[in-house]
Interface confidence: low
């Protein structure tokens, strides 16, 4: 008699997560008498997926009525597929007995599950960096299948090239994760800049997922300091101005020192934003020249975002009297702007 064949026509089937998978199996003969069972995997550790005779398999249903006479179609449908269902499924014929004896297995159908990647999560550096420094951003997405995936980085719409990307694991798995690091060189104009991590996958139908991060969270733009002395007033008072410009973030403390002694401390708050996202702040100090016999050394000291202080000092000459109303005494700038120490 002709040898019984167990035919699984599809070597592989691919299904989107959440959908149903149909695994086809037919036999070439009704004899010998005995049941069909479905297993995932082979060998002693195989997992029983469906047994017509007994057991409770809520997600598995036969495609045709296996109880009807002369039925040779033992295909099954598995509903609500998840990545954990991936694997090779075998349709196995048993010969009726006590116990039933395994007679023949189909060649197996590999079920692969197409699962969407999770929304990319972008994280930036733990501490701020200044312009011309390089910072790293990391993008992660998980739970996708198949393994093939494309990840791109953009800064203000321009693709970044200094990127390192890994997909894990290297071998076969029910689902995969991607982690990518992009290195970005900061500029002073980057307060309003944004980096985007874009993930494309076969499950997304050409509509990639994006994760974003604002460079404002990663950048520190140190201030420029400029100190100027206004005209001498009739009441022998000099108005000295400290202009602090182009800084970010807003967290800034300004201290005036007269001959090394603290005169006044101010904190920046509710400042208007420049077009490039930075801030400016102007502070002034009135110095009563007639109260001093010697020249007065004034220092504008700025602490920005917890960084070491930046000083700008100059001397107000009090020896050169009389003081004509409307005369303009230039400040002698004896300080240095130490912005580059960060």
């Amino acid at each position: 008699e002709e040898e019984l064949q167990v035919i699984q026509p599809e070597k592989s089937v691919s299904v989107a997560a959440g959908d149903s998978a149909t695994l086809n199996c037919t036999v070439s003969s009704l004899i010998p008498v005995g049941p069909i069972q479905w297993f995932r995997g082979a060998g002693p550790g195989r997992e029983l997926i469906y047994n017509l005779k007994e057991g409770h398999f809520p997600r598995v249903t036969p495609v045709s009525d296996p109880t009807k006479r002369n039925n040779m179609d033992f295909s099954i449908r598995i509903s609500n597929i998840t990545p954990a269902d991936a694997g090779t499924y075998y349709c196995v014929k048993f010969r009726k007995g006590s116990p039933d004896v395994e007679l023949k297995s189909g060649a197996g159908t590999e079920l692969s599950v197409r699962a969407k990647p999770s929304a990319p999560v972008v994280s930036g550096p733990a501490v701020r960096a200044t312009a011309e420094h390089t910072v790293s951003f990391t993008c992660e997405s998980h739970g996708f299948s198949p393994r093939d995936i494309t990840l791109k980085w953009f800064k203000n719409g321009n693709e970044l090239s200094d990127v390192q990307t890994n997909v894990d694991p290297a071998g076969k798995s029910v689902s995969y994760s991607i982690r990518s690091t992009a290195r970005v060189v900061l500029t002073r104009r980057d307060v309003h800049s944004q980096v985007i991590c874009e993930v494309a996958h076969v499950t997304l139908q050409g509509d990639p997922l994006r994760g974003t991060a604002n460079l404002s969270e990663a950048i520190r733009v140190p201030p420029f300091l400029e100190v100027t002395q206004q005209s001498m007033r009739a009441d022998n008072q000099v108005n000295v101005t400290c202009q602090v410009t182009k800084f970010y973030p807003q967290r800034l403390q300004l201290t005036w020192l007269e001959n090394g002694n603290v005169s006044r401390t101010e904190m920046a708050s509710a400042l208007p934003e420049n077009k490039d996202g930075t801030y400016n702040w102007t502070s002034w100090l009135l110095v009563n020249v007639s109260a001093h016999r010697d020249d007065v050394k004034l220092t504008c000291q700025v602490e920005h975002d917890g960084q070491p202080a930046v000083n700008k000092s100059f001397s107000v000459k009090v020896s050169a009297h009389p003081k004509e109303q409307g005369s303009n005494t230039a400040a002698e700038n004896t300080g240095t702007n130490e912005r580059n120490i960060y």
Partner: antibody, heavy 123, light 107 residues
Amino acid sequence: QIQLVQSGSELKKPGASVKVSCRARGYTLTDYAMNWVRQAPGQGLEWMGFINTYTGEPTYAQGFKGRFVFSLDTSVSTAYLQIGSLKAEDTAVYYCARTRGYYDFDGGAFDYWGQGTLVTVSS
Amino acid sequence: DIQMTQSPSSLSASVGDRVTITCRASQNVGTHLAWYQQKPGKSPKALIFSASYRYIGVPSRFSGSGSGTDFTLTISSLQPEDFATYYCQQYNTYPLTFGQGTKLEIK
């Protein structure tokens, strides 16, 4: 039935280039990755890399970066291997081989192979 | 790269013999291992994937086993058409690598 049909043997001079084709029959080219494998005369099998037929993105093994280019023309279900600046040591049979597994672009076991294309480089 | 070492490099056997070819990986490849048969002048033919699963149409006398680093291909009863060169291949990690081959000859 499923077949990978490769172009015929080539005899080339050193410095020339060659383009080997591999046509997929009996299945959809873009459902399976296409690998390229080299076998020098009397030697074993050496994996050159593969092309993701869905995105067109090639992956090259270390010794095959630069002069070797994998490409596709999905309109004619064909993958190509181009070798530039041929050297005598490029003389070998080149096989295309399909990766097992639907939508599996990640290398893997090769269930179907082309018949091979002998490329001979000689002056 | 993962090195795949087959042993023996060649062996002679007779029709009806049971033959075992071993393949050792230089690091763990799980069960991501395949076996191929190649006859002179022909392209390789896939026999086994995932270390132990036969492809459709491959006779049941061919079986594979193993996981991790040690694998075997067993031919339970040699047939005349089985004399060929056999290769193992790991596909756990890039680059994919093959063993050097085992030539099975008629005694």
